[in-house]
């Protein structure tokens, strides 16, 4: 499911519970996606020893995965709500092609990979409603994305495993950074 179910069984026993605010819904959605990534990483890590490798050992790759930097306004120092929100949405839009690549990369977690992809689309919609400056958000070019996808799928098995691992790790880090920033807003 692209939207997380209730937090726990207590939800059922609390019919008068306040509906979630926009911020709470976004927070919950990110946590739901992170749980999905965690499940996918388990399968990936069980198949190879890449998860034990240090970041430095895996740094030499030509993937242009979105990453938070000081200038994006999402860190505690230099925090800027509007700049940060634009970065989060832009980054998630850029991750979509990589999430598409992850489809068919998992045997026992195929549904989980689809759920992560669909949940991310929902998260983008939630965030776009929150953003004031939608004009500043650049959407990736579909043609460029299509050729990137073809190129990634043409890699040998080892590189595809490495790519899968790097996408999951980078996406996890991006979402964690986003969550920390959104909780400051």
């Amino acid at each position: 499911a692209p939207v997380p179910p209730g937090e726990d069984s207590k939800d059922v026993a609390a019919p008068h519970r306040q509906p979630l605010t926009s911020s709470e819904r976004i927070d919950k959605q990110i946590r739901y996606i992170l749980d999905g990534i965690s499940a996918l990483r388990k399968e990936t890590c069980n198949k190879s020893n890449m998860c034990e490798s240090s970041k430095e050992a895996l740094a030499e790759n030509n993937l242009n995965l979105p990453k938070m930097a000081e200038k994006d306004g999402c860190f505690q120092s230099g925090f800027n709500e509007e700049t940060c929100l634009v970065k989060i949405i832009t980054g998630l839009l850029e991750f979509e092609v990589y999430l598409e690549y992850l489809q068919n990369r998992f045997e026992s977690s195929e549904e989980q990979a689809r759920a992560v992809q669909m949940s991310t689309k929902v998260l983008i919609q939630f965030l776009q409603k929150k953003a004031k400056n939608l004009d500043a958000i650049t959407t990736p070019d579909p043609t460029t994305n299509a050729s990137l996808l073809t190129k990634l799928q043409a890699q040998n098995q080892w590189l595809q495993d490495m790519t899968t691992h790097l996408i999951l790790r980078s996406f996890k880090e991006f979402l964690q950074s986003s969550l920390r920033a959104l909780r400051q807003m």
Partner: antibody, heavy 116, light 110 residues
């Protein structure tokens, strides 16, 4: 394991850098936090380093404390030290697998004494 | 800014007693709360995370509950090695805070 070093007796106003060194794993895969404890007092959170460049600090530590990271060490740089900074300083590891901060591996601490 | 208030600050109990320590957050932190045990001259040790999940190697007499703003650490039957100081810690947000930890609860022998 984690080990802190660099703690010593310093005079007020002297800058000091503490180092947290990892054995058996690479710190690049983890978040690292610094916590201090004044003699006979409770735990006081100082700050955390996430990736290579994202940090967060307690409100009272901003501007006076700086955390930086390499693959094997995490440094805590302290400036304008006063007697109130006298404490045992601990570094701790957060496995970074989830979104909530929790510190599951700690060093034994290094004592910093600020006195004239 | 999230503040953590722990109570009591100290308590006296006997071996075999059931001990309860509470921790209150100044705003909702979901279930993002951990409990630590610290013995004199030693580093803290993680006991419970996510409010109720026991850390590896921690005896089952320790349990945690709560979500939102109110949390509880319970020791079902106090053992001699449990006399120590216990701290709660919020992991929800480490920005714009004075301290992530509660003030601590010292569990002493009656």
């Amino acid at each position: 394991s984690l080990e802190e070093s660099g703690g010593r007796l310093v005079t007020p106003g002297t800058p000091l850098t503490l180092t947290c060194t990892a054995s058996g794993f690479s710190l690049s895969n983890y978040y690292v936090t610094w916590v201090r404890q004044a003699p006979g007092k409770g735990l006081e959170w100082i700050g955390i380093i996430y990736g290579s460049d994202e940090t967060a600090y307690a409100t009272w530590a901003i501007g006076r404390f700086t955390i930086s990271k390499t693959s094997t060490t995490v440094d805590l740089k302290m400036t304008s030290l006063t007697a109130a900074d006298t404490a045992t300083y601990f570094c701790a590891r957060d496995d970074s697998s989830d979104w909530d901060a929790k510190f599951n591996l700690w060093g034994q601490g290094t004592l910093v004494t600020v006195s004239s | 800014a999230i503040q953590m208030t722990q109570s009591p600050s100290s308590l006296s109990a006997s071996v075999g007693d059931r001990v309860t320590i509470t921790c209150q957050a100044s705003q909702s932190i979901n279930n993002e709360l951990s409990w630590y045990q610290q013995k004199p001259g030693k580093a803290p040790k993680l006991l419970i995370y996510r409010a109720s999940t026991l850390a590896s190697g921690v005896p089952s007499r320790f349990s945690g509950s709560g979500s939102g703003t109110d949390f509880t650490l319970t020791i079902s039957s106090l053992q001699p090695e449990d006399f120590a100081t216990y701290y709660c810690q919020q992991g929800y947000s480490l920005r714009n805070i004075d301290n992530a930890f509660g003030g601590g609860t010292k569990v002493e022998i009656k």
